[in-house]
């Protein structure tokens, strides 16, 4: 029998400086574009190579962005969230939620949700 797959959720404040080509990531989500079932939150879907986020190194694909410069991202339309990032200024503070997969159960068995198997 496979072990249970659990998740360790942590939050982090990430301060990015907008680079020549911007912040350097893509997002999905919003009230009109639910990426995760029953969750209209905003998630990172791509980190652009050599962009500001990639060079900083802390933001990861799959992270949930909770706020931008202190402004909550709950209940936003997708395009409104995009516009909020684009208008966020030179120094951008992101409150993010990392979700790290943790394997519990018998050693040597992978859970169904483990992408490494």
């Amino acid at each position: 029998m496979n072990g249970r797959v659990d998740y360790l959720v942590t939050e982090e404040e990430i301060n990015l400086t907008r680079g020549p080509s911007g912040l350097g990531f893509n997002i999905v989500g919003g009230t009109d574009q639910q990426y995760v079932s029953n969750d209209s939150g905003i998630y990172v879907s791509r980190i652009k190579e050599n962009g500001a986020a990639a060079l900083d190194g802390r933001l990861q694909e799959g992270d949930k962005i909770l706020s931008v410069n202190g402004q909550d991202l709950k209940n936003l339309l997708h395009q409104d969230a995009v516009d909020l990032f684009r208008n966020a200024g030179y120094a951008v503070s992101l409150r993010v939620q990392h979700r790290l997969q943790v394997q519990n159960g018998p050693i040597g068995h992978r859970g169904e949700g483990d992408p490494s198997g």
Epitope: G22, F25, N26, Q33, S45, K48, H78, V82
Partner: nanobody, 125 residues
Framework: QVQLVESGGGSVQAGGSLRLSCTAS????????MAWFRQAPGKEREFVAA??????YYADSVTGRFTISRDNAKNTMYLQMNSLKPEDTAVYYC?????????????????????WGQGTQVTVS
């Protein structure tokens, strides 16, 4: 990993029409930003059209003749090509990226996209 498969290419007389399709894998197709590029023999890859959450974008050379659209239920993007000209002859490629950039979107920049199809040949005589 997203996989893209183009279809619908072929040979047509000038003034005719074709509809290209690009079918994508993945359960979150509605979140993809997608585009069509083309490459004629001996020429650079050229932007044709793109469709994002916020709307459609076209190269000047195809505006008014080509229409990009998508059917999220079928995981498919389309390029309706009317009033075709010999200079539209090329291999047409579908491209995609998951989500919307938080930066200024440059639909014609190939670096905006992570995934590419194998292409479908369009010949206009």
């Amino acid at each position: 990993q997203v996989q893209l498969v183009e279809s619908g290419g072929g040979s047509v007389q000038a003034g005719g029409s074709l509809r290209l399709s690009c079918t994508a894998s993945g359960r979150t197709f509605s979140t993809y930003t997608m585009a069509w590029f083309r490459q004629a023999p001996g020429k650079e890859r050229e932007f044709v059209a793109a469709i994002s959450w916020s709307g459609a974008y076209y190269a000047d050379s195809v505006t008014g003749r080509f229409t990009i659209s998508r059917d999220n239920a079928k995981n498919t993007m389309y390029l309706q090509m009317n009033s075709l000209k010999p200079e539209d002859t090329a291999v047409y490629y579908c491209a995609a990226v998951i989500g919307s950039t938080v930066d200024s979107y440059r639909p014609g920049d190939p670096l905006e996209y992570d995934y590419w199809g194998q292409g479908t040949q369009v010949t206009v005589s």
